[in-house]
């Protein structure tokens, strides 16, 4: 069985303040079953950015329909970017369970925010 890969193709993304940022993430396999979550930062303090199954993420939307069968694209779009959104974002695969078990993280995408052009 091929090892699951979580692919974040861009090491960095630069966005002007006020614009939307797309953070790309795909997985190489549908197995094992379990959710993808997005975080900002690493370690115990990492911030939850997007979780499909629950939570309040008013500025974050999935690029593809994550409920669609055989979906392997878990990219997200963050709207109305501000300097406070800068940081490194990680796409993380979990195995379904009680609780879900973290399996693999993408390498991370660093989001930088440029001043809005005048």
């Amino acid at each position: 069985e091929e090892e699951l890969q979580v692919i974040q193709p861009e090491k960095s993304v630069s966005v002007a303040a006020g614009d939307s940022a797309t953070l790309n993430c795909t997985v190489s396999s549908l197995i094992p079953v379990g959710p993808i979550q997005w975080f900002r930062g690493a370690g115990p303090g990492r911030e939850l950015i997007y979780n499909l199954k629950e939570g309040h993420f008013p500025r974050v939307t999935a690029v593809s329909d994550p409920t669609k069968r055989n979906n392997m694209d878990f990219s997200i779009r963050i709207s109305n970017i501000t300097p406070a959104d800068a940081g490194t974002y990680y796409c993380v695969k979990f195995r379904k369970g009680s609780p879900d078990v973290e399996l693999k993280s993408g390498a991370g995408t660093e989001l930088s925010v440029r001043a809005k052009p005048s």
């Epitope: 115990p44 911030e47 939850l48």
Partner: antibody, heavy 117, light 108 residues
């Protein structure tokens, strides 16, 4: 405005238990790790425990096996169950919100725990 | 475990003067060092993280710098509300999250 309000402190005897609560408001509680930090009278700050957004728990060696951190996301509340309390656990216990940088950006006012016979 | 040593333990400064104190890490923490201010009877307040980035709402008179494993917090012109205890904290190696022993800034 972000607010963290601790409760549950008090005077207990060595070996007894206490459960601290921290009610959070003004931010999306489920999206952030939260932590407990304590301060003995006249002393500095000592990190006690942290619970991540996914529920992973971390403890200082001094409390491992005696204290249990938990969170109830539906109530936006953080807890610290303290068993087998010792005199050296006497302190003001603060809860704090953790940023993705692993620093503590908002703190409660604290609740005093006194362990004495 | 990373040990943080703050010096001096107490600093006596007159209002309007510059205050500088340090925090030395027992091993490398990169730039992952934060500073907190605590006034008597109050909770700590985050001032600086990543060695030199001011937290939201912190006045520009507070600045941080790094030289290797030695970190410095400078208050350019002390105001009456700045007399407090200042703690450093490393945020690179966890757990545990470790704090320095504190520097008390008192009125001269």
């Amino acid at each position: 405005d972000v607010q963290l309000v601790e409760s549950g402190g008090g005077l207990v005897r060595p070996g007894e238990s206490l459960r601290l609560s921290c009610a959070a408001s003004g931010f999306t509680f489920t999206n952030y790790a939260v932590t407990w930090v304590r301060q003995a009278p006249g002393e500095g700050l000592e990190w006690v425990s942290l619970i991540s957004v996914t529920g992973t728990t971390y403890y200082a060696d001094s409390v491992k096996g005696r204290f249990t951190i938990s969170r109830d996301n539906s109530k936006s509340t953080l807890y610290l169950q303290m068993n087998g309390l010792r005199a050296e656990d006497t302190a003001v216990y603060y809860c704090a919100k953790v940023t993705w940088k692993n620093v503590f950006d908002y703190w409660g006012l604290g609740t005093l725990v006194t362990v004495s016979s | 475990e990373i040990v943080l040593t703050q010096s001096p333990g107490t600093l006596s400064v007159s209002p309007g003067e510059r205050a500088t104190f340090s925090c030395r890490a027992s091993q490398t923490v990169g730039s992952k060092l934060a500073w907190y201010q605590q006034k008597p009877g109050q909770a700590p307040r985050l001032l600086i993280y990543d060695a030199n980035t001011r937290a939201t709402g912190i006045p520009a008179r507070f600045s941080g710098s790094r030289s290797g494993t030695e970190f410095t917090l400078t208050i350019s012109s002390l105001q009456s509300e700045d007399f407090a205890v200042y703690y450093c904290q490393q945020h690179t190696d966890w757990p545990p999250y470790t704090f320095g022993g504190g520097t008390k800034v008192e009125i001269k």
